[in-house]
């Protein structure tokens, strides 16, 4: 807290300019009018104030706007945003995407702070949904943003927003998140032709059910092993050897290198060894010839 002292003669600030960096904290408090500061916030960012000086400027704005800053001030906060607490940000009503971009720019290249997380949360809640433009902006600044959302939060993403998602935005998503995103992607890309559709849907396939994988196997898609390894185990298990061969195309040879890893390992255990041998890859661990496979879960369902 800066104590109230009279402004020395001739030091009253008539505008926000670089001469103010030479003011002591008490001089800033005494000589800078809060209303002037609010109208010239766009200048603050261009002036190399110390963080101590920024604290004083923040204090002045807090006194002027105890209920929270107006968006006209928020948009021009610049480095003063680094002085805001999540509690301060919760008082704001940010509706403009330009404001959001301006504030994210301040923290660009750094991890998402609690302040940024609060800002994004306020913005998205205010909009009611995560629209395409917002998602575009957020993933540009934070590629991992989408995967930081809970499945419940992801459910508010409209299918139209999926067009903004890049493959790297899904790198850290877990299966539960992909389960929510995949149906939206399927809907978003449904009018595309086969090869174009596969290019777009590929990153989301970790949420695809068996029937969709079977359908893809009929389309000569040549799925790479990296994508195959990210598929849901429960979706891969029912696929036949022929379907996996069609799904992977020339990449089928990569199964050998992954035979000890899920989902390949579990899939091998479900296939007849005879069928696996037809691939000529030396895959071992299938069901020996002559053995009968009883699906006990099916038997229980019938009784």
């Amino acid at each position: 807290e800066v104590e109230k002292t009279a402004c020395p003669s001739g030091k009253k600030a008539r505008e926000i300019d670089e001469s103010l960096i030479f003011y002591k904290k008490w001089e800033l408090e005494a000589c800078v009018d809060a209303a002037l500061l609010a109208t010239q916030m766009d200048r603050v960012n261009a002036i190399p104030f110390t963080y101590e000086q920024l604290d004083v400027l923040k204090h002045k704005l807090d006194e002027l706007y105890p209920q929270g800053y107006p968006e006209s001030v928020i948009q021009h906060l610049g480095y003063l945003f680094l002085k805001m607490s999540p509690e301060d940000i919760r008082k704001w009503n940010v509706t403009s995407l330009e404001t959001l971009k301006a504030l994210l720019e301040v923290n660009k290249g750094h991890e998402m702070s609690p302040q940024v997380a609060t800002l994004i949360d306020r913005f998205v809640k205010g909009r009611g949904q995560l629209d395409k433009d917002t998602l575009d902006t957020l993933t540009a600044f934070y590629p991992g943003y989408l995967c930081s959302l809970s499945p419940e939060e992801l459910s508010s993403v409209p299918p139209s927003s999926i067009w903004a998602v890049r493959p790297q935005d899904l790198d850290t998503c877990d299966p539960r998140q992909l389960d929510v995103l995949y149906p939206k992607a399927r809907l978003a890309f449904q009018n595309m032709n086969g090869s174009e559709y596969f290019v777009k849907i590929q990153s989301f396939l970790g949420g695809a059910p068996t029937e969709d994988l079977k359908a893809l196997s009929q389309q000569n898609v040549s799925m790479d092993l990296a994508t195959f390894m990210k598929l849901r185990t429960d979706a891969v298990l029912p696929l036949t050897v022929a379907e996996v061969q069609k799904l992977l195309g020339p990449h089928v040879e990569g199964l050998k290198a992954e035979e000890r890893h899920r989902p390949v390992r579990d899939w091998i255990l479900r296939q007849r060894q005879d069928d696996l041998d037809t691939l000529g890859l030396g895959l071992q661990g299938g069901i020996p010839n002559g053995y009968l496979v009883l699906d006990l879960s099916m038997q229980e369902a019938l009784s």
Epitope: E18, P48, Y51, L54, L82, N107, G109, H110, S113, Q115
Partner: nanobody, 119 residues
């Protein structure tokens, strides 16, 4: 964390020149603005010059035209203060300062280097 070490101070006659250096180490990629402050015995610390992250320089009125601040953004960030036409009233402990990006935004200080200008 950023460490700052000043050098180049000393005793000089009025009208003479000195060049102060400040070597930064540690998280130098996060440095935003760099500054030279000075503190004379019994007086408050005052800002002498600032060089912003975009290279713009700002000077205290009484040193304008005599002092030049500069920085290099090489592997070892260095801050300089070229002081010409020195006056006895420039005598003080000159302290290097740097601040960093991000939350909460920290200020770092060197120990200072003494400049004494004799008449």
């Amino acid at each position: 964390q950023v460490q700052l070490v000043e050098s180049g101070g000393g005793l000089v006659q009025a009208g003479g020149s000195l060049r102060l250096s400040c070597a930064a180490s540690g998280s130098i990629s996060s440095i935003r603005h760099m500054r030279w402050y000075r503190q004379a015995p019994g007086k408050q610390r005052e800002l002498v010059a600032t060089v912003s992250n975009d290279g713009s320089a700002y000077y205290l009125g009484s040193v304008k035209g005599r002092f030049t601040i500069s920085r290099t953004n090489a592997k070892n960030t260095l801050l300089y203060l070229q002081m010409n036409s020195l006056k006895p009233e420039d005598s003080a402990l000159y302290i290097c300062n740097a601040d960093t990006w991000g939350w909460p935004g920290a200020d770092y200080w060197g120990q200072g280097t003494q400049v004494t200008v004799s008449s």
